[in-house]
Each structure stands twice: as structure tokens, then as C-alpha cells.
């Protein structure tokens, strides 16, 4: 007869091992008791369990409540045990050994291998801003036996750096991804991509970039000067610029303070019928916390009056 | 031949505590198994727990938890603790040996009285 068995038994952390040892006896050929018992080298052989044809199973106190039989139907030549709610400590070697009757004993080994699946984390790098240099993003770290794979999925361009710490019984990777810092990315998504044989499907970590900056500052309705008369209504100034975070706004008159009637509504500076008294300088201030920029205009609120006068000057000139 | 000799039977109350020693003599080389069984008046000797060479142990669901066997194989002795005794596990004890060549209990002593009552 021969026994048969595997080479390696794989199993994830917390599953149950299926050991298995199956004697293909001749005709006429018994089991009388299979004995399972973990061999690791340098250490002497310490006993598992014994299944006995008559008696049944015998667990050792070490592995109490932790070593079965497969459920029924079982074969008598099937000395398979179940290892239940594996741990890396369980990673090694095991022989099981069946004495048989009349042909005598026969062993074989195997090796098992306990997958620890990856826990990863990821930690954002220092704040990003615009005009910065290459600057650490994100970092990856996840651990796990055997050592798991981390990379990145991103449209961002930038550099990653890897390194590896080995443990007695894991392996914890860290990646980091760098870059050079620029508005475009921006709510950009940046995702950790830990792969690992105990893992069904590959864990993702998406970080979202948030680069700091703050636009110049121009400003909108001047485009047309004659539309500033005297009596319009309606007129507005408004400041345009984008930055992270939001930029505040905050409107001033150069050469004094604001006319009355006025009206300030964030970004917008809203002018009731214009008069004469509305001509000045006037300043769009934009802030946030990573920078400020200004902007100013000369609004010149013309009279039709004197204009139409000239008008006639020049005609009658010409 | 295995020559296996008891000791350590006798009355104790319920809920109390005995340890019976089981030493072996002879060709002990041979031994596989060992085990204590129990014969209760009228009723049949039943398995109550074993050990093997490696030291793996099988109780009876009835002493699971209360029993507990041990081997000291410098001693060629098996031990047998009993805490938590209940009158139903008044009996006569046996030790009892498994050949390596018949895998069955063929080797026995000669049986120590447990009683538990108050």
C-alpha cells in the first residue's frame, strides 16, 4: 500500500486546515490507527492527534477542541484530521504516520502554509501646495505572510518608493508616492492597491488630493466703459479667482471708503443708479489660507450730457 | 507479557477528589494505548478515557471536564485525576494496555474500588 497526501496545505488565517492522509491499501489490508503529529526541524516531534480505528479520536491537551475528524461518511483508510481556526503559529511541518495491518507503517509530510490576508492603512503626507517641490503624498502600509504587494492606481503622475520590513512570521510593506504639487490635481484620487494571495480580490484605499493654491485675481463688467453712465441701474463688479480651499472676498475703494448704497455680496460688488460719486479705484481682495491676491479697477462713471456735448464739438469741428 | 498494578481507589463524598495511578511492568515497549475503563454493578465496563505514546487523550462525554489522564513515560505510569466526583462514578476501575501489534486492550490490571457517597 502507499499513503497519500499533499505537499503543501494552504490555508487563510482563521479557516480550517483539512490535513489530509489516505492509505491505498492492497485487498484484505487494515488501519489500525493513524497518528498526527508536528515535526518542525530542530524541535522533536510533538503529537497532534491519534485516530484510532476502535477508539476513536485522541487530541493531545495542546490542540484541545482544535483537531477533528471530517464529517461523515468517512472511509477507514482516510486518516485525514481537520485543524480547526488556524494560526500562524500552526505553520510547519506535520507528518502523519499509519500502521497498518498486516503491512506495517508508513508515513508521509506535509507542509502548511497559514496566509495572513493584509490589514493596509494609509496616511496622508504633509499638506500640498502649489509650488512646492517633490513632496510625499500618500503612504501605504500593509503586513501579512507571505509579504503582500502595495502599488498605486492614479492618473497623477509622481514617483513611488517601496520598502520591506521582515517579521518573524509576516512582512510589512510600506509604498510612498510622491509628487510635484499643482492645482490640476485637485480632487485627483490616489488608491493604495494591496494585493495578497489571501485575499479574494485586491484591497483599495482611495485618498483624495487636496492641493493648495490660490488663482491671481481679475476683474468682470468693465468690459464695456459706456455702459458706466449716470442713471444706469444694475451695474456690478465682480471678482473672479479659484483656490483651495475657497477663497473669501473682500472689496475696498482705494481713494476712500465704499460709496453708500453699495452693496457687498461675497465675490460681487453690487452699485445702486450710478453717479458721478461711484467713479474711483476700486480693490477686489481674495485670501485663503494658503495665500491673498488683490485686484484693482478704475471705474469712471461717465456723463451723457458732457459727453453728447463733446460729441457735437467734434462734429461741428470736423 | 504488560503487567499493570492500580492504586489509589476508595470512598470519597461527592464533589471531592481521587487520583489513581496505573504502573506498567514487562514489555512496555509494546505498549500503544493506554486507558482506564469502569464496571459499575450490573452494567457493562465502558471506556471512560485513554491516552496515547504522543500524549493525545479521549475522555467519555460523561467525564469531560471532571477527569483528566496523564502518562509519565520515565515512570511507565498513567495517571487518572477525578475532581468533582458524582455518585455515579462509584465503580471498579480498571488500567488497562493496547498492544502495538493488535490495536485492542488486551493487558489489565486488577481493578481498584472508587465508591462516592455520603
Known amino acids: 500500500g502507499e499513503l497519500e497526501t499533499s505537499d503543501v496545505v494552504t490555508v487563510v488565517l482563521g479557516q480550517d486546515a483539512k490535513l489530509p492522509c489516505f492509505y491505498r491499501g492492497d485487498s484484505g489490508e487494515q488501519v489500525g490507527q493513524v497518528a498526527w503529529a508536528r515535526v518542525d526541524a530542530g524541535e522533536g516531534a510533538q503529537e497532534l492527534a491519534l485516530l484510532h480505528s476502535k477508539y476513536g479520536l485522541h487530541v493531545s491537551p495542546a490542540y484541545e477542541g482544535r483537531v477533528e475528524q471530517p464529517p461523515p461518511p468517512r472511509n477507514p483508510l482516510d486518516g485525514s484530521v481537520l485543524l480547526r481556526n488556524a494560526v500562524q503559529a500552526d505553520e510547519g511541518e506535520y507528518e502523519c504516520r499509519v500502521s497498518t495491518f498486516p503491512a506495517g507503517s508508513f508515513q508521509a509530510r506535509l507542509r502548511l502554509r497559514v496566509l495572513v490576508p493584509p490589514l493596509p492603512s494609509l496616511n496622508p503626507g504633509p499638506a500640498l501646495e502649489e509650488g512646492q517641490g517633490l513632496t510625499l503624498a500618500a503612504s501605504c502600509t500593509a503586513e501579512g505572510s507571505p509579504a503582500p504587494s502595495v502599488t498605486w492606481d492614479t492618473e497623477v503622475k509622481g514617483t513611488t518608493s517601496s520598502r520591506s520590513f521582515k517579521h518573524s512570521r509576516s512582512a510589512a510593506v510600506t509604498s510612498e508616492f510622491h509628487l510635484v504639487p499643482s492645482r490640476s490635481m485637485n480632487g485627483q484620487p490616489l488608491t493604495c492597491v494591496v494585493s495578497h494571495p489571501g485575499l479574494l480580490q485586491d484591497q483599495r484605499i482611495t485618498h483624495i488630493l487636496h492641493v493648495s493654491f490660490l488663482a491671481e485675481a481679475s476683474v468682470r463688467g468693465l468690459e464695456d466703459q459706456n455702459l458706466w453712465h449716470i442713471g444706469r441701474e444694475g451695474a456690478m463688479l465682480k471678482c473672479l479667482s479659484e483656490g483651495q480651499p475657497p477663497p473669501s472676498y473682500n472689496w475696498t475703494r482705494l481713494d476712500g471708503p465704499l460709496p453708500s448704497g453699495v452693496r457687498v455680496d461675497g465675490d460681487t460688488l453690487g452699485f445702486p443708479p450710478l453717479t458721478t460719486e461711484h467713479s474711483g479705484i476700486y480693490v477686489c481682495h481674495v485670501s485663503n489660507e494658503f495665500s491673498s491676491r488683490d485686484s484693482q479697477v478704475t471705474v469712471d462713471v461717465l456723463d451723457p450730457q458732457e459727453d453728447s456735448g463733446k460729441q457735437v464739438d467734434l462734429v461741428s469741428a470736423s | 507479557e504488560v503487567q499493570l498494578v492500580e492504586s489509589g481507589g476508595g470512598l470519597v463524598q461527592p464533589g471531592g477528589s481521587l487520583r489513581l495511578s496505573c504502573a506498567a511492568s514487562?514489555?512496555?515497549?509494546?505498549?500503544?494505548?493506554m486507558g482506564w475503563f469502569r464496571q459499575a454493578p450490573a452494567k457493562q465496563r465502558e471506556l471512560v478515557t485513554s491516552?496515547?505514546?504522543?500524549?493525545?487523550?479521549r475522555y467519555a462525554d460523561s467525564v469531560k471536564g471532571r477527569f483528566t489522564i496523564s502518562r509519565d513515560v520515565s515512570k511507565n505510569t498513567v495517571y487518572l485525576q477525578m475532581n468533582s466526583l458524582r455518585a455515579e462514578d462509584t465503580a471498579v476501575y480498571y488500567c488497562?494496555?493496547?498492544?502495538?501489534?493488535?490495536?485492542?486492550?488486551?493487558?489489565w490490571g486488577q481493578g481498584t474500588q472508587v465508591t462516592v457517597s455520603s
Open positions: 514487562g514489555s512496555i515497549s509494546s505498549i500503544n494505548l
Open positions: 491516552i496515547s505514546p504522543g500524549g493525545s487523550v
Open positions: 488497562a494496555a493496547e498492544s502495538e501489534r493488535t490495536y485492542y486492550f488486551d493487558s
